[in-house]
């Protein structure tokens, strides 16, 4: 018996087609993705093949103006229209709190939304009961397929799930649900979830009874053969993990932003064992036409967005590199721009001894969600910025000891190379890392811009000195694992909305050309 699994993950509000780098579509003939194009391909496969599931592995929420304006209603509407069979909750589904998940999505979705490792407690338990499920058994052709969901246990550090949701260890929570499905004679089980590729592989290895793992969160691109676009494969598709009980378990993910549709064919024997698995992500490029009815619906929903944010704020004459491939690995000019805007927004001439009260900015690279292409006449709009900074956060002022900052920069590279969001972009700081050293001892130079000076210059960080730093509220609250900031900050004052800070700076500067200038170096 053959099953076709179609899957998406980390779509992040890319309802409309995008440029190849998943930023706003500029040249329509070269644009990719979007729900109208996705629907065309899904329908084509559904017509051609008998046993098809369309699954999403989380993080539909957050990423463009669509989410800023519609707050998840757009996700429910268009996923319903595409007839998704199931979705796993991602960390970003909690960005507007639990209410922002329940009302627009959980109550409106016509498909099951899954997570086995999220447990509700207190008054929320009865309110959310039945709105998301640990597993779902679906009829597929003449067979049944069990789908168990999971969500990153790091979600409380990454989003706003509140205090009444407990995020358990994925493997610990999944095993009893899979065991239950087995006792109910479900012998074909997919783990669908949002914890990242490393956890996906662990689930495949450790959870007895899981036949296939469909993941998300790490934006992992897997491909067998010559990849069709710019993404470099992290491994073959599917990635095969040998489980502890000796089974070959296919693990898949489909990059992000709706650029690809994951396509996996699994052959099962009569006992539900995987005999074979093969496939590849399908690049949703312009060779696939956009479905006219979905496109018309997109255009109808689009009207509200146009009024919101299409005015030009200023111009860029350089490419603003906000790609995760840059900002999570090295100094990127989008990070520099944002940090410069953050400092500029906090210019307060204190007295004759200080040129300013604050000179330093840190910004988690994972918070930069899109680049901006200068080839659209250089125009920058609020809409463009909303794709870069979609989280609706604030840029806050904190006071920290030098020792805390040093810990933060060690944390920045403690697991360097995994495309994780904690890699710091900076302003008013020069940092040098030596990645050959062990985690926790990789910062070899950390110089900070003086404030008590008439001519600003860089001096070595002093461990016992107290510094003011501008940073996202996300970091002030210990997000992306920066618990040391939350635990050790001496003062915290909330600031202005992130997009507004950057838009004001761009409007003020009129023309911008941020460079990569050696703020972050590797020895």
């Amino acid at each position: 018996w053959e099953l076709t699994i179609l899957h998406t993950n980390d779509v992040h509000s890319r309802l409309e087609q995008t440029s190849e780098d998943s930023s706003k579509c500029v040249n329509a003939s070269r644009c990719m993705g979007g729900v109208a194009r996705l629907f065309t391909k899904v329908q084509q496969i559904r017509r051609a093949e008998p046993n098809v599931l369309l699954l999403d592995a989380g993080d539909q929420y957050q990423g463009t103006i669509w989410f800023t304006v519609y707050k998840g209603a757009e996700v429910a509407h268009f996923m319903n229209a595409l007839r998704y069979d199931a979705m796993a909750l991602g960390n970003h589904e909690f960005d507007n709190g639990v209410e922002g998940l329940i009302e627009p999505l959980l109550k409106e979705a016509k498909f099951p939304i899954l997570s086995a490792n999220i447990k509700a407690k207190g008054p929320l338990a009865s309110q959310i009961s039945g709105l998301y499920l640990p597993y779902k058994v679906l009829p597929v052709g003449d067979e049944v397929v069990g789908i168990v969901g999971y969500t990153s246990k790091e979600t409380p550090f990454l989003s706003n799930p509140g205090t009444n949701l407990v995020f358990e260890d994925e493997i610990t929570a999944l095993q009893p649900e899979v065991d239950k499905l087995k006792t109910l004679n479900v012998n074909k089980i997919i783990a669908l979830g949002h914890s990242g590729f490393e956890t996906d592989k662990l689930i495949a290895q450790k959870v007895r009874g899981v036949d296939v793992v469909v993941g998300g969160h790490s934006n992992t691109f897997l491909y067998t053969g010559n990849p069709p676009s710019k993404e470099v494969p992290a491994g073959k598709y599917p990635f095969i993990v040998t489980s502890d009980d000796g089974r070959k378990v296919p693990v898949v993910q489909a990059y992000a932003f709706g650029k690809y549709l994951g396509y996996l064919k699994i052959e099962f024997d009569e006992r539900g064992n995987v005999i074979s698995s093969h496939g590849n992500p399908i690049l949703l490029n312009s060779s696939i036409p956009e479905d006219p009815s979905i496109k018309a619906d997109i255009n109808k929903w689009r009207i509200k967005l146009d009024n919101y944010s299409t005015q030009e704020l200023g111009k860029t004459i350089v490419y603003l590199d906000g790609s995760s491939q840059s900002c999570r690995f090295r100094e990127c000019n989008m990070g520099n721009l944002i940090c410069d805007a953050m400092i500029n927004n906090n210019l307060r001439h204190a007295d004759e001894m200080f040129w300013n009260h604050v000179s330093m900015c840190i910004l988690n690279g994972g918070g930069i969600r899109s680049p901006i292409d200068e080839r659209n006449n250089g125009t920058i709009t609020w809409e463009n910025l909303a794709a870069v900074l979609p989280f609706g956060g604030t840029f806050d002022l904190v006071q920290l000891k030098g020792s805390t900052l040093k810990k933060a920069f060690e944390h920045s590279v403690h697991r360097y190379g995994q495309s994780t969001g904690e890699f710091l972009q900076v302003g008013g700081i020069h940092v040098v890392y030596d990645l050959s050293r062990k985690p926790g001892d990789r910062v070899v130079k950390l110089d900070v811009l003086c404030t008590k000076c008439r001519v600003p210059s860089y001096d070595p960080l002093k461990m016992d000195e107290i510094y003011k730093v501008i940073l996202p509220n996300f970091l002030a609250n210990g997000g992306d694992g920066f618990q040391m900031i939350k635990d050790e900050l001496l003062r915290h004052d909330s600031g202005d909305q992130d997009i507004n800070v950057v838009s004001t700076y761009i409007s003020k500067m009129k023309v911008i050309y941020p460079a990569v200038e050696g703020r972050i170096k590797f020895s």
Partner: antibody, heavy 119, light 107 residues
Framework: QVQLVESGGGVAQPGRSLSLSCAAS????????MHWVRQAPGKGLEWVAL????????YYADSVKGRFSISRDNSKNTLYLQMNSLRAEDTAVYYC????????????WGQGTLVTVSS | EIVLTQSPATLSLSPGERATLSCRAS??????LAWYQQKPGQAPRLLIY???NRATGIPARFSGSGSGTDFTLTISSLEPEDFAVYYC?????????FGPGTKVDIK
Amino acid sequence: QVQLVESGGGVAQPGRSLSLSCAASGFTFSDYGMHWVRQAPGKGLEWVALIWYDASFEYYADSVKGRFSISRDNSKNTLYLQMNSLRAEDTAVYYCVREGQWGSRLDYWGQGTLVTVSS
Amino acid sequence: EIVLTQSPATLSLSPGERATLSCRASQSVSRYLAWYQQKPGQAPRLLIYDASNRATGIPARFSGSGSGTDFTLTISSLEPEDFAVYYCQQRSNWIFTFGPGTKVDIK
């Protein structure tokens, strides 16, 4: 032990409605698909409808599609069959049945309730 | 819709004899075929599922075989309590059909 007890049968006029219930016990009701199967007097078995364990899917025989509606209340361990626009040919004993393994077997049957459609 | 045909309509045998009941499908039903026994005034009872698996508590004298379109229920040595009506049943795409039944009576 598994028990299925049907109720609600009786006499109804053609074109009228009737509602059957089935009280389940002895197993985790919310884990199992449930069916209604009927048997006209002196005739064979005829499958009527299936409802998924969580009520997310329903399937019907062509002979009742659009007239009958299967539903369940997992909090009350109860299965229902709402029968509208009844016809003489709907006269039968109606059995409540538990699905044993995703439709490959119907493993526990109630004793049935008689529905008579007559003017 | 898949139609099931059972033969013979009636099988007259004596206790201790072997009974062979046939069920033919109008198209392939894979392995999803079950057999039920019904005695007068009682609800049906599951005997065999997935063509050849005996249900819990069913004596070993009952066995099922076949695949695709042709299936057989065999009672190796009829006991007095085995005289009843036997139905085959299939499911295809979640639509279920029963055969018309075979009556096994005492000769």
